[in-house]
């Protein structure tokens, strides 16, 4: 396990509707690892999200990171967000830790989609 996972893209762009409930999956991110088997298994996490609005869970079957809405968003309040995600191997033997100190990161631009209120009669 001397290869660390690296994101395919330095920037991901996702959109979320302001009507989306918490827990909604708003998109996926993906890293690649040149190792095989369990040495290629990875874990995604949030490195930076000052708004604490999003979370990332790992799909261990596809090795994708799934970006999840943790708090409802409001277009009028904030119509875009930026979060930084990181990825690390799930299994790293002690003797190979030196190869894995710097986790690969990516930036995610998230655009909030406006949902017009229906007119009140």
């Amino acid at each position: 396990n001397d290869n660390k996972p690296i994101f395919k893209e330095s920037l991901y762009r996702l959109t979320v509707s302001e009507s989306a409930p918490t827990g909604t999956s708003i998109g996926t991110i993906m890293a690649y690892d040149n190792d095989i088997g369990e040495n290629a298994e990875m874990d995604y996490s949030i490195e930076e999200d000052d708004s604490q609005t999003f979370d990332i869970i790992t799909n261990h079957e596809t090795q994708e990171g799934i970006v999840i809405l943790k708090k409802k968003v409001d277009f009028e309040h904030q119509n875009h967000y930026g979060i930084r995600a990181k990825v690390k191997n799930h299994h790293v033997p002690e003797q190979l830790m030196k190869y894995h100190t710097e986790a690969s990161t990516t930036f995610i631009k998230i655009q909030v989609e406006d949902v017009d209120e229906p007119p009140v009669f």
Epitope: S10, L11, R13, T15, D50, S51, E76, H77, Q78, N79, H80, G82, F107, Q111, E113
Partner: antibody
């Protein structure tokens, strides 16, 4: 090097229409969100509209909503602003600007094109 | 809409002096999503600072930005002749709005 060149400005009567163009070069146009910003004579900057990198999302300032339309043609590396129902208060220099890749600030601007709405 | 108020309106200084420009937001600007631009007469604006404190490519280190929440500052440590211009702050926390500008003029 990155270059943005606006054209299409001119004098138009109130209620008239005009289409501005912004020719982009020196970067991968299809990877960047693009904006229009205007500046009335002797005044400050006012954001007008944005279009996403792939053209699927557009947003407008309230002052132009329903009258202006932003669009882009990736095959021509060109950004457009269709302005209808023009008013005297739309008189300004119109700049196109590129949004930073990892941010939402504007890292490159064109030289601007002047639109005068007058009878 | 987040309203940005810049002060002072005009700053009269001599080359070599330190300039301190202020930008106050009507509500908190998330994630320090604030930029500063310089506009010389007859020219387009130029990005100086983004993220409240990060210098844009090619910007001299005499320009620095600081602040968070609702109060932000642009400092020019020692004014050069080419620095006399109008400076705008911009927030991009929610949509995009600009301050009304501060003119830095030669005393």
């Amino acid at each position: 090097q990155v270059q943005l060149v606006e054209s299409g400005g001119g004098v138009v009567q109130p209620g008239g229409s005009l289409r501005l163009s912004c020719a982009a070069s020196g970067f991968t146009f299809s990877s960047y969100d693009m904006h229009w910003v205007r500046q009335a004579p002797g005044k400050g900057l006012e954001w007008v509209a944005v279009i996403s990198y792939d053209g699927t999302n557009e947003y407008y300032a309230d002052s132009v909503k329903g009258r202006f339309t932003i669009s882009r043609d990736t095959s021509k590396n060109t950004l457009y602003l269709q302005m209808n129902s023009l008013r005297a208060e739309d008189t300004a220099v119109y700049y196109c600007a590129r949004e930073r890749y990892f941010d939402w600030s504007f890292d490159y601007w064109g030289q601007g094109t002047l639109v005068s709405v007058s009878s | 809409e987040i309203v940005l108020t810049q002060s002072p309106g005009t700053l009269s200084l001599s080359p070599g002096e330190r300039a301190t420009l202020s930008c106050r937001a009507s509500q908190s600007v998330s994630n320090t999503y604030l930029a500063w631009y310089q506009q010389r007469p007859g020219q387009a604006p130029r990005l100086l600072i983004y993220g409240a404190s990060s210098r844009a490519t090619g910007i001299p280190d005499r320009f620095s930005g600081s602040g968070s929440g609702t109060d932000f500052t642009l400092t020019i440590s020692s004014l050069e002749p080419e620095d006399f211009a109008v400076y705008y702050c911009q927030q991009y926390s929610n949509s995009w709005t600009f301050g009304q500008g501060t003119k830095v003029e030669i005393k």
